[in-house]
């Protein structure tokens, strides 16, 4: 069965500050007013979920409040920003969309962006 | 309340087909796709396909893609699943069942019998 | 196809007792999973779909937990009308189920 189609860019390179955005859009095939988006991170074999949030269509996506992760929505399309992130943090982040509400539940998994982070070289010191 | 009755069990010679309905009330027809799904004696559920009343857009089971066709009329609400080619190991329950990636109702099931 | 792997095939249990069922499939379906319950010559009933969400009307004993590969079913206590055979089913690329779970009185 084809799942929800979730679109994401392939790529991405986090800031210096190590803060990464890309847009999660989906193709609704539904009236959906309450959706959740996951991102999930995919290293190696392993998959852990990085945030999650649910938002009612045309308000913001809340975060919880120590999540790294913050958001905006427009439409069928979510604006994902994810801070704190270091090199080793560099990996497939995934978006994940489920319409919740109202039936019927639509779930669509994107291919996912894959994020590369560069520490910062440290500055050298100044002698003066 | 939302419900799903399908047509009356059959049975069929080998070689035949088959054409099972599914006459859906209760909710807008035109939101919910259409599934339908098997189960074999002594087997497990086997899914076959979907189609969307809303689109007439369908997806298959690869396993049925060359036998199953998918239809609705949505005049009357109703889908319809026909399996061509029918061999003794289509003998089953075949069931209709509305949803997007869930499906959260089902019809009573229909039996065919495929013996010669 | 993704090949789900549901176990134990059958269980006894009794009213009362906490039942764990798992399902796992043969590669990462990302929460993508659901869960019926089918009893002798009834439709399935959904209850369980997205890993984790309890479908609508059905008792909060029911819950499903997992992630990546393995989930699991959970009855927390099981009552006399539960005792049915248990199905998981993938929704990624073609909808493929486990072979089921029948839970029978001890």
């Known amino acids: 069965c084809k799942a929800m189609h979730v679109a994401q860019p392939a790529v991405v390179l986090a800031s210096s500050r190590g803060i990464a955005s890309f847009v999660c859009e989906y193709a609704s095939p539904g009236k959906a007013t309450e959706v959740r988006v996951t991102v999930l991170r995919q290293a190696d074999s392993q998959v852990t979920e990085v945030c999650a949030a649910t938002y009612m269509m045309g308000n913001e996506l809340t975060f919880l409040d120590d999540s790294i992760c913050t958001g905006t929505s427009s439409g069928n399309q979510v604006n994902l920003t994810i801070q704190g992130l270091r090199a080793m943090d560099t990996g497939l982040y995934i978006c994940k969309v489920e319409l919740m509400y109202p039936p019927p539940y639509y779930l669509g998994i994107g291919n996912g962006t894959q994020i590369y982070v560069i520490d910062p070289e440290p500055c050298p010191d100044s002698d003066f | 309340q939302v419900q799903l009755v399908q047509s009356g069990a059959e049975v069929k010679k080998p070689g035949a087909s088959v054409k099972v309905s599914c006459k859906a009330s209760g909710y807008t027809f035109t939101d919910y796709k259409i599934h339908w799904v098997r189960q074999a004696p002594g087997q497990g559920l086997e899914w076959i396909g979907y189609?969307?009343?809303?689109?007439?857009?369908?997806d298959y089971n690869q396993k049925f893609k060359s036998r199953a066709t998918l239809t609705v009329d949505n005049s009357i609400s109703t889908a319809y699943m026909e399996l061509s080619r029918l061999r003794s190991d289509d003998t089953a329950v075949y069931y209709c069942?509305?949803?997007?990636?869930?499906?959260?109702?089902w019809g009573q099931g229909t039996l065919v019998t495929v013996s010669s | 196809d993704i090949q789900m792997t549901q176990s134990p095939s059958s269980l006894s249990a009794s009213v009362g007792d906490r039942v764990t069922i798992t399902c796992g499939a043969s590669?990462?379906?990302?929460?993508?999973l659901n869960w019926y319950q089918r009893k002798p010559g009834k439709a399935p009933k959904l209850l369980i779909y997205g890993a984790t969400n309890l479908a609508d009307g059905v008792p909060s004993r029911f819950s499903g937990s997992g992630s990546g590969r393995d989930y699991t079913l959970t009855i927390s206590s099981l009552q006399p009308e539960d005792f049915a055979t248990y199905f998981c089913?993938?929704?990624?690329?073609?909808?493929?189920f486990g072979g089921g779970t029948k839970v029978e009185i001890k």
């Open positions: 069942a509305r949803g997007g990636d869930a499906m959260d109702y």
């Open positions: 189609i969307y009343p809303y689109s007439g857009s369908s």
């Open positions: 089913q993938n929704i990624l690329g073609t909808w493929t």
């Open positions: 590669e990462n379906i990302y929460g993508a």
